[in-house]
């Protein structure tokens, strides 16, 4: 950065090099150039010469004043016009930053994605600070009182192997930057209550031709959790509103969910699951499209998840990883 240049003088900022966005600031430049009584002192911001709000304080020093400074970052340097020099002489430079103190972190959430081996903690950091802001995640065992701290600039993954103090913990987050520090409320967690099952995936769909065509959605998860509740949501692609349906699930076999849908309509489906009775859900699975036929039965699989439709064809394919037996997973 500009701070690495060799200086022939001194540049400083009041109130500070990092300051609150919108403040009035003063930048001072003091020349210390051998055999030079500066005729004039110039200020540059991001390489562009400033023409206004410059005050000469004494023979060697000048001040540049900014009202309501709103730029997150700027490189400042100043130069002197020396009587016997053809070019301006560089005095010194400084990078300045403006921003905000951190908000109180809220919505602290810690989950363990099944098979990940990590506890992932996230939070709402609040408004953008524009300046370097660090977060310290505190994890305190309620059984041993031992506390661990993790430094990060966003979220944190904590190895579950490092959580040796039993099952119950307090988690809180401290946010700090040059302008201030804030601390979240404490979140109490039990490791068994924050596990999110392995992602549920829709593998294929087919519409069976009958008096009333029936669409079957095939979906699965590699979870080993016994009691899992899932939601499937679907809508016609032309609609805004989702239909959300709940399924009691047993992932010892591929799930088959049956729907009576309108003919000749393109639908989109998504699924998500949680350990039954627990707090946290998986994110919704990726969008799965299926167009119901007018009359001809149709199969749609992961291999055909583009915006093209093989109308009139019976497409029968299966995604790898979904080769278990297709028993019906839902009743009623």
């Amino acid at each position: 950065g500009i701070t690495n240049i060799n200086c022939s003088g001194h540049i400083w900022v009041e109130p500070a090099t990092i300051f609150k966005m919108g403040m009035n600031i003063s930048i001072y430049c003091q020349a210390a150039i051998k055999n030079c009584q500066p005729r004039k002192l110039h200020f540059y911001k991001n390489g562009i010469k400033e023409r206004f709000q410059i005050t000469r304080i004494n023979k060697t020093t000048a001040r540049l004043w900014y009202k309501n400074f709103l730029e997150p970052h700027a490189s400042m340097y100043c130069t002197a016009e020396c009587p016997k020099h053809f070019q301006e002489t560089l005095i010194c430079g400084k990078d300045i930053s403006s921003g905000y103190p951190p908000d109180i972190p809220d919505e602290v959430t810690c989950v363990i994605y099944e098979y990940s081996g990590n506890m992932t903690c996230t939070w709402n950091a609040g408004k953008l600070t524009y300046i370097d802001t660090k977060y310290v995640v505190h994890v305190k065992s309620l059984e041993t009182e031992e506390e661990q701290q993790y430094l990060t600039s966003s979220y944190i993954n904590i190895s579950t192997d490092s959580l040796q103090g039993g099952k119950k913990y307090l988690v809180w987050v401290q946010a700090a930057n040059a302008l201030g520090m804030e601390e979240s409320k404490q979140l109490q967690i039990h490791l068994d209550d924050i596990v999110i099952p392995s992602a549920a995936v829709i593998s294929r769909a087919e519409t069976i031709n009958a008096t009333v065509p029936k669409t079957i959605i095939y979906w699965d998860s590699q979870t080993t959790i016994e009691k899992v509740s899932c939601e499937m949501r679907y809508k016609a692609t032309t609609n805004q509103t989702w239909n959300v349906k709940e399924f009691d699930t047993n992932f010892t076999y591929v799930q088959q969910s049956e729907f009576y849908l309108e003919p000749n309509i393109k639908y989109v489906f998504q699924v998500r699951c949680q350990e039954t009775g627990k707090r946290y859900w998986q994110p919704w699975s990726s969008l799965f499209f299926h167009k119901t036929p007018e009359t001809v039965p149709q199969v749609t699989s992961k291999a055909f998840q583009h915006d093209t439709w093989n109308s009139g064809l019976t497409v029968a394919s299966i995604s790898t990883g979904h080769l278990t037996s297709d028993n019906r997973g839902d009743i009623g």
Partner: nanobody, 124 residues
Framework: EVQLVESGGGLMQAGDSLRLSCAAS????????MAWFRQAPGKEREFVAA????????YYADSVKGRFTASRDNAKNTMYLQMNSLKPMDTAVYYC?????????????????WGQGTQVTVSS
């Protein structure tokens, strides 16, 4: 759309029997499951019984098992709830509901269409 109209409710004595009917009209070919729910004053709506339309498989809440029987008349697009050995705790508004898919039968939120309800009051 499926329209549902319940009938047969009334004021009964404990131990009596009563038959509720639910007549469906409109897109009845889209019925996957038809169910009865009930709601007592100040309480949440709860599952009572359901019948899967395609194969007449029936499901019951534990509180009514052995006393209530769900059946259907396919030709009339009508579902019935035969209620025997009525108890004061059976007092509620009984609602008929339909869903178009194989989602969990006892969840209120899974049902797409609802009737207006019929009042059943059982005095001791």
């Amino acid at each position: 759309e499926v329209q549902l109209v319940e009938s047969g409710g009334g004021l009964m004595q404990a131990g009596d029997s009563l038959r509720l009917s639910c007549a469906a009209s409109g897109r009845t070919s889209y019925i996957y499951t038809m169910a009865w729910f009930r709601q007592a004053p100040g309480k949440e709506r709860e599952f009572v019984a359901a019948i899967r339309w395609s194969d007449t498989t029936t499901y019951y809440a534990d509180s009514v098992k052995g006393r209530f029987t769900a059946s259907r008349d396919n030709a009339k697009n009508t579902m019935y709830l035969q209620m025997n050995s009525l108890k004061p705790m059976d007092t509620a508004v009984y609602y008929c509901a339909v869903k178009r898919d194989s989602s969990t039968y006892y969840r209120v939120r899974n049902y797409d269409y609802w009737g207006q309800g019929t009042q059943v009051t059982v005095s001791s």
